[in-house]
Interface confidence: medium
Amino acid sequence: ARILRAPESHNVTFGSFVTLHCTATGIPVPTITWIENGNAVSSGSIQESVKDRVIDSRLQLFITKPGLYTCIATNKHGEKFSTAKAAATISIAEWSKPQKDNKGYCAQYRGEVCNAVLAKDALVFLNTSYADPEEAQELLVHTAWNELKVVSPVCRPAAEALLCNHIFQECSPGVVPTPIPICREYCLAVKELFCAKEWLVMEEKTHRGLYRSEMHLLSVPECSKLPSMHWDPTACARL
């Protein structure tokens, strides 16, 4: 088996769609498999076409984390296997940009992770700096939610409420749809009262560089930068 076209590396923003191409040839026509960080690809769609002993495989991915993607072309002559490999890296640029961008729209929350936390028919802000805002924001919550499984029973419900209301911010509709941040007082209550130990551990890990990316920072608000409920009763959301 021989690879004619290797997949290309990409540097993309969180929530982007990327298609990796791998083309191979051989007699007989090889099969192509994709590996993600050493394991079989768990998500994404694969499309294949074969023409004139050439196989073309396209892997479409929704990017939520960096990764090494390997295309493996294999065919068999009698008892002998022939294998060719080619790899591409997907890295993520500007993790925190979407949070600074106020471009988006209001829509009812249709996800699952925050169903029990957000009000029924809650109007949330969906950020159009993501390719697919609903999917990207739901994945952000899902990723951070998994980390909450290890926190204390006192901290967990408060952290879940903070997380969901921070990533799926309440939305003020109108001419310029605007996300309504959590009130500073509620954020501080979670940080200093309900989750004081956990928050310290997380900040310590951040300073020591134990987090490989800034992704978790998207799901943890900086309390000091949030508006106070005493400034404008409608400018921030109460948990």
Epitope: C106, L123, S172, P173, G174, V175, V176, T178, I180, D232, P233, T234, A235
Partner: antibody, heavy 123, light 108 residues
Framework: QVQLQESGPGLVKPSQTLSLTCTVS??????????WSWIRQHPGKGLEWIGY???????YYNPSLKSRVTISEDTSKNQFSLKLSSVTAADTAVYYC???????????????WGQGTMVTVSS | EIVLTQSPGTLSLSPGERATLSCRAS???????LAWYQQKPGQAPRLLIY???SRATGIPDRFSGSGSGTDFTLTISRLEPEDFAAYHC?????????FGGGTKVEIK
Amino acid sequence: QVQLQESGPGLVKPSQTLSLTCTVSGGSISSGGYCWSWIRQHPGKGLEWIGYIYYSGSTYYNPSLKSRVTISEDTSKNQFSLKLSSVTAADTAVYYCARGGRWLQLRDVFDIWGQGTMVTVSS
Amino acid sequence: EIVLTQSPGTLSLSPGERATLSCRASQSVSSSYLAWYQQKPGQAPRLLIYGASSRATGIPDRFSGSGSGTDFTLTISRLEPEDFAAYHCQQHSSSPLTFGGGTKVEIK
């Protein structure tokens, strides 16, 4: 107490540009949070939102008028202005300037209005 | 755009009576972002209600707003002589901001 006063010609010829100014007294147009709007009312009819300018200088217009409308501000004179180009008889109306409320839920409702100025488009 | 239809066009009532004005939207108004204004002849509109049910500063409590989705109501519990005027609804839920055609409340 904030007050708004419209000024400008009461008669404009068809195809010309209608120009109106709103002078704000009792408060600064550049003070945070407010948006400054133009709304019109055709004789005996309902109200129509034309557009507004935010304290930050960003402008937002009604899509039906967007190609003909410009709203600008002169902070030194504490005024904001409306220009409506290529006018026709259908633009004959009372033109109001108004202030959008400061709070987030109030920015697209109008809590203070000028008394209005009648503009007739006729040759 | 959201089209607002007000009914009735004219309401003839006597002072002391209850007035019920309707405003129907062509599509759902998010978060009940609907406002009501009062307008007297030769004057500019005056904000009464925003967010469907919140009274603006200085508005007497005989004025109340209710409703959600596509159907909204302005109620004046006991009409005072100064309440005879035109009333406009406005949605502040999506762009462009739109107003209803108005309801005139006149003395019977």
